[in-house]
C-alpha cells in the first residue's frame, strides 16, 4: 500500500535571467527512493538514480544543475520556462509517486522599470 505523500514548493515565480530551485520531498513512507525523474510537461530534464548518479538531458546541460539533494536548479530562466514541472519518485517497494510544481517566469523588475520609463 502506498502511504507516502510528495510535498513540493507548489506554485513559484522567478525573474527572467535568474535561477530557481525545484524541490520535492517524499514523506510518510519508509520506502527506499531508487530514482527521481524531473520532467517539464513531457520533456525529460534530468534523472537522479541512487546507483548511477545524475543524468542531465543533453539539451538542458548548460542550464540545469543537479541538486541540492534530489532537487534541480534551473538557471538562465526565460519566459519559455513558465509551466508545469513534475518530480517522479521511483521507490521500493511502494512504486511511483509524482509531485507537481508550477513555475512562472516573470520579466525582471529592472526590465519592467526600463520599459515603463523609456524615452521615445
Amino acid at each position: 500500500m502506498m502511504t507516502g505523500t510528495i510535498e513540493t514548493t507548489g506554485n513559484i515565480s522567478a525573474e527572467k535571467g535568474g535561477s530557481i530551485i525545484l524541490q520535492c520531498h517524499l514523506s510518510s513512507t519508509t520506502a527506499q527512493v531508487t530514482q527521481v525523474n524531473w520532467e517539464q510537461q513531457d520533456q525529460l530534464l534530468a534523472i537522479c538514480n541512487a546507483d548511477l548518479g545524475w543524468h542531465i538531458s543533453p539539451s538542458f546541460k548548460d542550464r540545469v544543475a543537479p541538486g541540492p539533494g534530489l532537487g534541480l536548479t534551473l538557471q538562465s530562466l526565460t519566459v519559455n520556462d513558465t509551466g508545469e514541472y513534475f518530480c517522479i519518485y521511483h521507490t521500493y517497494p511502494d512504486g511511483t509517486y509524482t509531485g507537481r510544481i508550477f513555475l512562472e517566469v516573470l520579466e525582471s523588475s529592472v526590465a519592467e522599470h526600463g520599459a515603463r520609463f523609456q524615452i521615445p
Epitope: 548511477l52 543524468h55 521511483h90
Partner: antibody
Framework: QVQLVQSGAEVKKPGASVKVSCKAS????????MYWVRQAPGQGLEWIAF????????TYNQRFRGKATLTVDTSISTAYMELSRLRSDDTAVYYC????????????WGQGTLVTVSS | DIQMTQSPSSLSASVGDRVTITCRAS??????LSWYQQKPGKAPKLLIY???SLPSGVPSRFSGSGSGTDFTLTISSLQPEDFATYYC?????????FGQGTKVEIK
C-alpha cells in the same frame, strides 16, 4: 553525422597496460556521457564504466574498479580508457558508445578496438 | 545486481515471419530497458530505448513493449538484414547489465 572512431588493435603482454582512444565528431562532445563496453570472443556485452565530459565525473561497474580508468580531452573531443594489469581474460573487443538523451543507454557506438593479451 | 535473462537464446525464422524475443529482469526496472542489434564483426546498434521508443532511422517493423520485469522485442516482418544477435539492457542501476543475447538465424 555522429561518429565515434576508435584507435587500432593492440597486442599486449600480461601485466602491461593499454590506452584505447575514442574520437567523437558530429555533436557537442561535452553534452553526452561516453560509455565503455567490452565483448570477449564469442561472448555477450559487459558494461565497464561511463564518463561525463561536462564535469569529468566517472561511474564504474564495481567489477572494473582498479582495472579501467576513464579520461577525456574535451579540446579534441576524445575519450580514453586505460586498462591496467592486463590478463589473458581481458582479451576482448572494447567499444566506446555515446550515451542516450533520456538515460543510461548507448545511442551511438564506435567500431570497437580488439585488445589481445598474450604472452 | 539486476540480472537480465533473454529467451530464446537462438531461433530460426524465415523472411516475412513475425519474430518475438523476450527479456526478463530480476527486479522491477519500470520501462528502463533498451534493445540492440549486433551483426557479426560489427558494433551493436540501438534499436529501442525506454522499452518502446524508436530512435530515428530504425525501421518501424521493430517495436518494443513491456514494463516492470517482462519485456518484448517484436520484428513484425523479418527482413534479410535482420538476421543478427539481439541484446536487451536495463538502464536503472549500477551495474548496467545486458541479456546474454538472442541469435536470429535463417531457417
Amino acid at each position: 553525422q555522429v561518429q565515434l572512431v576508435q584507435s587500432g588493435a593492440e597486442v599486449k603482454k600480461p601485466g602491461a597496460s593499454v590506452k584505447v582512444s575514442c574520437k567523437a565528431s558530429g555533436y557537442a562532445f561535452s553534452r553526452y556521457s561516453m560509455y565503455w563496453v567490452r565483448q570477449a570472443p564469442g561472448q555477450g556485452l559487459e558494461w565497464i564504466a561511463f564518463i561525463d565530459p561536462y564535469n569529468g565525473g566517472s561511474t564504474y561497474n564495481q567489477r572494473f574498479r582498479g582495472k579501467a580508468t576513464l579520461t577525456v580531452d574535451t579540446s579534441i573531443s576524445t575519450a580514453y580508457m586505460e586498462l591496467s594489469r592486463l590478463r589473458s581474460d581481458d582479451t576482448a573487443v572494447y567499444y566506446c558508445a555515446r550515451g542516450g538523451d533520456y538515460g543510461w543507454y548507448l545511442g551511438v557506438w564506435g567500431q570497437g578496438t580488439l585488445v589481445t593479451v598474450s604472452s | 545486481d539486476i540480472q537480465m535473462t533473454q529467451s530464446p537464446s537462438s531461433l530460426s525464422a524465415s523472411v516475412g515471419d513475425r519474430v518475438t524475443i523476450t527479456c526478463r529482469a530480476s527486479q522491477n526496472i519500470y520501462t528502463y530497458l533498451s534493445w540492440y542489434q549486433q551483426k557479426p564483426g560489427k558494433a551493436p546498434k540501438l534499436l529501442i530505448y525506454n522499452a518502446k521508443s524508436l530512435p530515428s532511422g530504425v525501421p518501424s517493423r521493430f517495436s518494443g513493449s513491456g514494463s516492470g520485469t517482462d519485456f518484448t522485442l517484436t520484428i513484425s516482418s523479418l527482413q534479410p538484414e535482420d538476421f543478427a544477435t539481439y541484446y536487451c539492457q536495463h538502464h536503472y542501476g549500477n551495474p548496467l547489465t545486458f541479456g546474454q543475447g538472442t541469435k536470429v538465424e535463417i531457417k
